[in-house]
Interface confidence: medium
C-alpha cells in the first residue's frame, strides 16, 4: 500500500498498526462517559466536556490541543414560560394542551437541564387559527395543496409531519405559503418501524417522544449575525431583523399522542391520496379547520423561546506532519447534543476519541504522519453548524491553501445493516480500496471483507459489483469545508436497510430517548459496528495523511460529471419547444466534460509514471490533486446562496440534507413552466450552463501539464 512508503519511523508503524490499536471496548467506554448528562450547546456542561476532551487528547499524545471560542446566536426555551399548543373553544378556553416535556426514561428522572422539545430559533408568538395539514411540507406538497386542491394556507396554522426533507425547508415553504405558524410532528408511519417495541423496550419512538431541531435556512452562512466572518470579540453583528436565515413564524414540535388530538378533529378536504396518510387513527383530512361539531374550535400556539448571543467552544487538536506539515487532513465531528446524544453526536465523538488515542499511541512510539492531522470537536452543530463554520471562517485563508481533505464524524450509526458513505468522487477509490482491506462486522459475512457485505447489501445503481456512494448534501459539519471552501470531503456511518425501513432518520433522533442504553441494548451491543466505522474513518484519515501520493482519482470525477450532465440535459429536454425557441444548448457543457475526461486520463498516466523520489515533482502532482476540488468553487457563489460556491454539488434548495448536482442549472430549470417571464427564466438557464461549462473546463485545465 502507498502508506507503507511514507514517513514511518519503523516498519511496524503502518495502517495495520493504527487499525489494530482501535478497540470496541474503548469506544463503548467513551460513549458511556459522553452520554451521562446533556451537553447542549452554550451550556456549562458542554464547556466542561470540551475541557475534558482537551485534557484527554493531550494525554493521548497530540502535539497541541486548543479551545477556540466564538459568540454566536443560539436559541432556548423560556424556563418559566413553557411552549405549548392548545385547542381552544369559542370562549377562548384551552380544552387541550400539548405536553410540556417528554417523559424521561428510567434512570434519568432526576437529571437536570433536559431541554424540553422546541424548534430552535422560532420567533415568539401566540398565533391562533384554523389548522391545515400539509403532509411533509415539501415543495411538491404545497404545489398539490395550492395548485391542485386550491387550498390557501394564508393566515392558517399548518401541521406537517417530520421526515423526507430538512425541517428548515418545511418552515420556509410554510412561510412562503402565508402560514402564521407551523406544528411539526412525528408520525408513526415515519418513526415507528413495524414489529419493534417503543423505547425503553425497543428502538421505536413512543407517543410522548419528540424530535428537537433547528429550523434555520442559513444556506451555509454560519452564525446568523456574522455571515462570512468569525463571531469573535471584534466582529460586527447584524441586528436580529437583518440576521441570516431566521424563521418569521412560530414553530413547535410535538409527538404523535399530541398530534392525534389535533388531527382527529380535522375537517375540510380529504387527503389527496394514500401518500398523504400516515399511521394514526385519524382521517388525515387537510382542512382548513375542524369538522362539524368542532368547527368553532381553533388551535393556538404559545411560543416564548428566546435567541441570545452565547459563547461556544471548539476543541482543535494537532498532530504535526513530519514531511508536509503545511498540508492538513481534518477529522471533525460535533460534541453538542440536544439531550444525551446517545447516537447524535456521541456515537461519533466516541469514535473520534478512539481514533485520536490510536494515532497518539503511534506518535508516542516515535511515528509521525507525513501530513498534519487536525482533530476537531465542534460545538453548536445542532444550532446550524456554527462551531465548524466559525472556525473555518476564521481560518479560511489557511484552509484554502493547505486543506487536503475533511472527514466528518457525526453519528457513527443510524442503523446496523450496512455501511453508508457520501463523499467527493476523488475519494471513491480510497473508500473502495480501504473497505476491501477491512473485515465485515455483518452476520453471515464472517471472514469476508467490508466491501463485499456493503456491495451485497447496498449495490451501486450504475455499476455491477460495486457499492453505492452518495453525493454530499449538507446538514452536517463538512458543509463549510466542501460547499464553501472546496476541500475534498467524505463521511461514513453504519445505516439501516432502506428497502425495509422507510422511516426517516432513526425513530428516536433528537429525542430524550437517545441514550447510551439505546445503543448498547438495541443497536450495537458488541460495538462492532462502531469499531468498523472507526476503521473506515480512521483508515481514510491515515491514508490521506500518510500516502506519498494523495489517494485521489480524478478519473472518477470525470465519470460523474458525464452522468450529471446527462441528468440535467434530460431534465431540460422535458421542454424541447422552449429549448428551441430560446436556443438553449448543452453542447458546450458536454464538450467541457469530454475535455475533462481526456485531461484526467492523461494526468492519471503521468501520476502513475512520474519519479516519486523527486520531492518537487511529487509536491507539484499532489498540489494538482489537492486543488482539483478547489477548482470547482465559483467565488461568486450560487444565486442567492453566496456561501454555497461548489458548482458541481450543493445542498438541494428543497431539502438541505440532499445533494444536488449542477445545482445552478437545476434550480434555474425547476418549475420553469410556471415562471411569469419565460424569456428571462430560460436566459438564466443559459447563464448557468455557461458557468458550469467554464468551471468544468477550468478545473480540467488545472490537471494539464504545468508547462
Amino acid at each position: 500500500k502507498s502508506s507503507s512508503e511514507a514517513t514511518n519511523i519503523t516498519p511496524k508503524h503502518n495502517m495495520k498498526a493504527f487499525l489494530d490499536e482501535l478497540k470496541a471496548e474503548n469506544i463503548k467506554k467513551f460513549l458511556h462517559n459522553f452520554t451521562q448528562i446533556p451537553h447542549l450547546a452554550g451550556t456549562e456542561q458542554n464547556f466542561q466536556l470540551a475541557k475534558q476532551i482537551q485534557s484527554q487528547w493531550k494525554e493521548f499524545g497530540l502535539d497541541s490541543v486548543e479551545l477556540t471560542h466564538y459568540d454566536v446566536l443560539l436559541s432556548y426555551p423560556n424556563k418559566t414560560h413553557p411552549n405549548y399548543i392548545s385547542i381552544i373553544n369559542e370562549d377562548g378556553n384551552e380544552i387541550f394542551n400539548t405536553s410540556l416535556f417528554e417523559p424521561p426514561p428510567a434512570g434519568y428522572e432526576n437529571v437536570s437541564d433536559i431541554v424540553p422539545p422546541f424548534s430552535a430559533f422560532s420567533p415568539q408568538g401566540m398565533p391562533e387559527g384554523d389548522l391545515v395539514y400539509v403532509n411533509y411540507a415539501r415543495t411538491e406538497d404545497f404545489f398539490k395543496l395550492e395548485r391542485d386542491m386550491k387550498i390557501n394556507c394564508s393566515g392558517k396554522i399548518v401541521i406537517a409531519r417530520y421526515g423526507k426533507v430538512f425541517r428548515g425547508n418545511k418552515v420556509k415553504n410554510a412561510q412562503l405559503a402565508g402560514a402564521t405558524g407551523v406544528i411539526l410532528y412525528s408520525d408513526p408511519a415515519d418513526y415507528f418501524a413495524p414489529g419493534v417495541k417503543s423505547y425503553p423496550d425497543g428502538w421505536n419512538l413512543p407517543g410522548g417522544g419528540v424530535q428537537r431541531g433547528n429550523i434555520l435556512n442559513l444556506n451555509g452562512a454560519g452564525d446568523p449575525l456574522t455571515p462570512g466572518y468569525p463571531a469573535n470579540e471584534y466582529a460586527y453583528r447584524r441586528g436580529i431583523a437583518e440576521a441570516v436565515g431566521l424563521p418569521s413564524i412560530p414553530v413547535h414540535p410535538i409527538g404523535y399522542y399530541d398530534a392525534q388530538k389535533l388531527l382527529e378533529k380535522m375537517g375540510g378536504s380529504a387527503s389527496p391520496d394514500s401518500s398523504w396518510r400516515g399511521s394514526l387513527k385519524v382521517p388525515y383530512n387537510v382542512g382548513p379547520g375542524f369538522t362539524g361539531n368542532f368547527s368553532t374550535q381553533k388551535v393556538k400556539m404559545h411560543i416564548h423561546s428566546t435567541s441570545e448571543v452565547t459563547r461556544i467552544y471548539n476543541v482543535i487538536g494537532t498532530l504535526r506532519g513530519a514531511v508536509e506539515p503545511d498540508r492538513y487532513v481534518i477529522l471533525g465531528g460535533h460534541r453538542d447534543s440536544w439531550v444525551f446524544g446517545g447516537i447524535d453526536p456521541q456515537s461519533g465523538a466516541a469514535v473520534v476519541h478512539e481514533i485520536v488515542r490510536s494515532f497518539g499511541t503511534l506518535k508516542k512510539e516515535g511515528w509521525r504522519p507525513r501530513r498534519t492531522i487536525l482533530f476537531a470537536s465542534w460545538d453548536a452543530e445542532e444550532f446550524g453548524l456554527l462551531g465548524s463554520t466559525e472556525w473555518a471562517e476564521e481560518n479560511s485563508r489557511l484552509l484554502q491553501e493547505r486543506g487536503v481533505a475533511y472527514i466528518n464524524a457525526d453519528s457513527s450509526i443510524e442503523g446496523n445493516y450496512t455501511l453508508r458513505v457520501d463523499c467527493t468522487p476523488l475519494m471513491y477509490s480510497l473508500v473502495y480500496n480501504l473497505t476491501k482491506e477491512l473485515e465485515s462486522p455483518d452476520e453471515g459475512f464472517e471472514g469476508k471483507s467490508l466491501y463485499e457485505s456493503w456491495t451485497k447489501k447496498s449495490p451501486s445503481p450504475e455499476f455491477s459489483g460495486m457499492p453505492r456512494i452518495s453525493k454530499l448534501g449538507s446538514g452536517n459539519d463538512f458543509e463549510v469545508f466542501f460547499q464553501r471552501l472546496g476541500i475534498a470531503s467524505g463521511r461514513a456511518r453504519y445505516t439501516k436497510n432502506w428497502e425495509t425501513n422507510k422511516f426517516s432518520s432513526y425513530p428516536l433522533y433528537h429525542s430524550v430517548y437517545e441514550t447510551y442504553e439505546l445503543v448498547e441494548k438495541f443497536y450495537d451491543p458488541m460495538f462492532k459496528y462502531h469499531l468498523t466505522v472507526a476503521q473506515v474513518r480512521g483508515g481514510m484519515v491515515f491514508e490521506l495523511a500518510n500516502s506519498v501520493v494523495l489517494p485521489f482519482d480524478c478519473r472518477d470525477y470525470a465519470v460523474v460529471l458525464r452522468k450529471y450532465a446527462d441528468k440535467i440535459y434530460n431534465i431540460s429536454m422535458k421542454h424541447p419547444q422552449e429549448m428551441k425557441t430560446y436556443s438553449v444548448s448543452f453542447d458546450s457543457l458536454f464538450s467541457a466534460v469530454k475535455n475533462f475526461t481526456e485531461i484526467a486520463s492523461k494526468f492519471s498516466e503521468r501520476l502513475r509514471d512520474f519519479d516519486k523520489s523527486n520531492p518537487i515533482l511529487l509536491r507539484m502532482m499532489n498540489d494538482q490533486l489537492m486543488f482539483l476540488e478547489r477548482a470547482f468553487i465559483d467565488p461568486l457563489g450560487l444565486p442567492d446562496r453566496p456561501f454555497y460556491r461548489h458548482v458541481i454539488y450543493a445542498p438541494s434548495s428543497h431539502n438541505k440534507y440532499a445533494g444536488e448536482s449542477f445545482p445552478g442549472i437545476y434550480d434555474a430549470l425547476f418549475d420553469i413552466e410556471s415562471k411569469v417571464d419565460p424569456s428571462q427564466a430560460w436566459g438564466e438557464v443559459k447563464r448557468q450552463i455557461s458557468i458550469a461549462t467554464f468551471t468544468v473546463q477550468a478545473a480540467a485545465e488545472t490537471l494539464s501539464e504545468v508547462a
Partner: nanobody, 127 residues
Amino acid sequence: EVQLVESGGGVVQPGRSLRLSCAASGFTFSGYGMHWVRQAPGKGLEWVAYISYDGSNRYYADSVKGRFTISRDNSKKTLSLQMNSLRAEDTAVYYCAKDPAWGLRLGESSSYDFDIWGQGTMVTVSS
C-alpha cells in the same frame, strides 16, 4: 417494588375541604398519567380525575368538576387531590392509580384503565 400509597383521608363536614396525597415508588412516575378513582360504599368504581405525565392536561368527572383539583409534583413523585365543597355523596374510598400507557395523553372521551392501584384512603363526608 412498584407501590402507590394514599394518605390524607378522614371524616369531614359537608362544605369543608380535604387534600389527599399519593406517594409513588418503583417506577418512572414522571412518565405516566395518573388517576384518582373512588368507590362509594356498596357501589361500583367511579373515575374521578386524570392528570397527564407533565401536568399539562387535567380531566375531571362531571360530578367533581369545579370542586376538585388534581396536581402532581414529579420531583417528589407525589400525586394530590384537593377536594373543596365536599358533599355527602363524595363519601368513598379514594384510590390513586397509574395509567398503563407511558406518556399517553388521554382525552375526555377516553375509557380509563389502570395497571397499578394504591390500597386506598377513606373519605367520609358527614355532619
